[in-house]
Interface confidence: low
């Protein structure tokens, strides 16, 4: 969290694998189209994928972070790139996809247990546990509080992905930034492709769900670049 | 001009509580993490805890879970540190501090720091 | 947990040197590191964060380097008002100080 508002996580640079030199990330992004990135023990290519170059993680998506892709971490060029899921290596918060944060180098969900420590939600309740465990975390709550606060639901105002409920992220909506679903296998999704396309997405789509990417849809491989459909695909 | 400024800090007994407050001026408050940072005399810096905008996650440092409370209001545009079960350990300078905007843990704007003295 | 240490501990220079300091990483912390100056009485201030990036105001003599797990803060020419103690910091883990003293 690492991190804190707007358009969120991705990965600067790889962390070494267990037992690795320190130093050295376990793996280098290319910068060549047909993108190579992480994606569990395998990589994996994003089909026509083009380095999105930018300067500020704003200009990336919801699923990306500005960084460089050298091994090194030398700023020279900086392009957006992929999020880590969870479960996968991480280094900081901002290196997990939204929805999740970094926990001893590892991405795990935020609905866990979010940022340093542990997290305290204050809820209500109308059985009188004081303290209740949920998914091996202790979770304080305060009975007598009138005001709870939960994970923004749909539609709710947001400043990033982590403070939303389960499948949803923090997506901008004119100059806002609201909490909008996850896409699912199927649905359309925003590849971007030329520098400033992000300033003018007022109306920003999420990531694709786990296990999904966004890819050109089969069908629309002739289509000319401009027309190219991207939805969300499995792997 | 961008600031925070805190009130709250004093003398204390063993055992006791102290709540510190940190008010904001010249930014948008709820935009932003904030955060409590302490310093022992003659130590280093400690981070204690942090709390998002909507105050829905909140995290403490090992040494003062579940005695400290991080609470904020936005309205008020203000950061809350409700400390209980004070020991002698938490005699500290205690600093709250705003992380940037797009996080990297890193804080950019420091509160003057107030004194809180446990001791009998 | 992160560990950050910072050397020398004291850093004894007269104004117009060149300062360097010091921080290591326990684990690979990529280029995310923040340095703070704090003098004495006073709040701390970042000066860089990113490991390479000058906050807000901060003037051009300092610079930050490293990645990884090494890291470097250099005062290109030191000023009077340079002296003082020097926090690295990644996430809530601080080093431990680097005082810069005049000699």
């Known amino acids: 969290t690492l991190n804190s508002v707007l358009n969120s996580n991705a990965i600067k640079n790889l962390p070494p694998p267990l037992g690795g030199a320190a130093g050295h990330p376990g793996s280098a992004v290319s910068a060549a189209p047909g993108i190579l990135y992480p994606g569990g023990n395998k990589y994996q290519t994003i089909d026509n994928y083009q380095p999105y170059p930018c300067a500020e993680d704003e200009e990336c998506g919801t699923d990306e972070y500005c960084a460089s892709p050298t091994r090194g971490g030398d700023a020279g060029v900086q392009i957006c790139l992929a999020c880590r899921k969870r479960r996968k290596r991480c280094m900081r918060h901002a290196m997990c996809c939204p929805g999740n944060y970094c926990k001893n180098g590892i991405c795990v969900s935020s609905d866990q247990n979010h940022f340093r420590g542990e997290i305290e939600e204050t809820i209500t309740e109308s059985f009188g546990n004081d303290h209740s465990t949920l998914d091996g975390y202790s979770r304080r709550t305060t009975l007598s509080s009138k005001m709870y606060h939960t994970k923004g639901q749909e539609g709710s105002v947001c400043l990033r992905s982590s403070d939303c409920a389960s499948g949803l992220c923090c997506a901008r909506h004119f100059w806002s930034k609201i909490c909008k679903p996850v896409l699912k296998e199927g649905q359309v999704c925003t590849k971007h492709r030329r520098k400033g396309s992000h300033g003018l997405e007022i109306f920003q789509r999420c990531y694709c769900g786990e296990g999904l990417s966004c890819r050109i849809q089969k069908d629309h491989h002739q289509a000319s670049n401009s027309s190219r459909l991207h939805t969300c695909q499995r792997h | 001009e961008v600031q925070l400024v805190q009130s709250g800090g004093g003398l204390v007994q063993p055992g006791g509580s102290l709540r510190l407050s940190c008010t904001a001026s010249g930014f948008t408050f709820s935009n932003h993490w904030i955060h409590w940072v302490r310093q022992a005399p003659g130590k280093g810096l400690e981070w204690v805890s942090g709390i998002n905008w909507n105050s829905g996650s909140r995290g403490y440092s090992d040494s003062v879970k579940g005695r400290f409370t991080i609470s904020r209001d936005n309205a008020k545009n203000s950061l809350y540190l409700q400390m209980n079960s004070l020991r002698a350990e938490d005699t500290a300078v205690y600093y709250c501090?705003?992380?940037?905007?797009?996080?990297?843990?890193?804080?950019?704007?420091w509160g003057q720091g107030t004194t809180v003295t446990v001791s009998s | 947990e992160i560990v950050l240490t910072q050397s020398p501990a004291t850093l004894s220079l007269s104004p117009g040197e060149r300062a360097t300091l010091s921080c290591r990483a326990s684990q690979w912390v990529s280029s995310y590191l923040a340095w703070y100056q704090q003098k004495p009485g006073q709040a701390p201030r970042l000066l860089i964060y990113d490991a390479s990036n000058r906050a807000t105001g901060i003037p051009a003599r300092f610079s930050g380097s490293g990645s990884g797990t090494d890291f470097t803060l250099t005062i290109s020419s030191l000023e009077p008002e340079d002296f003082a103690v020097y926090y690295c910091?990644?996430?809530?883990?601080f080093g431990q100080g680097t005082k810069l003293e005049i000699k």
């Open positions: 910091a990644w996430q809530e883990f």
């Open positions: 501090a705003r992380e940037r905007p797009v996080a990297t843990g890193a804080f950019d704007i």
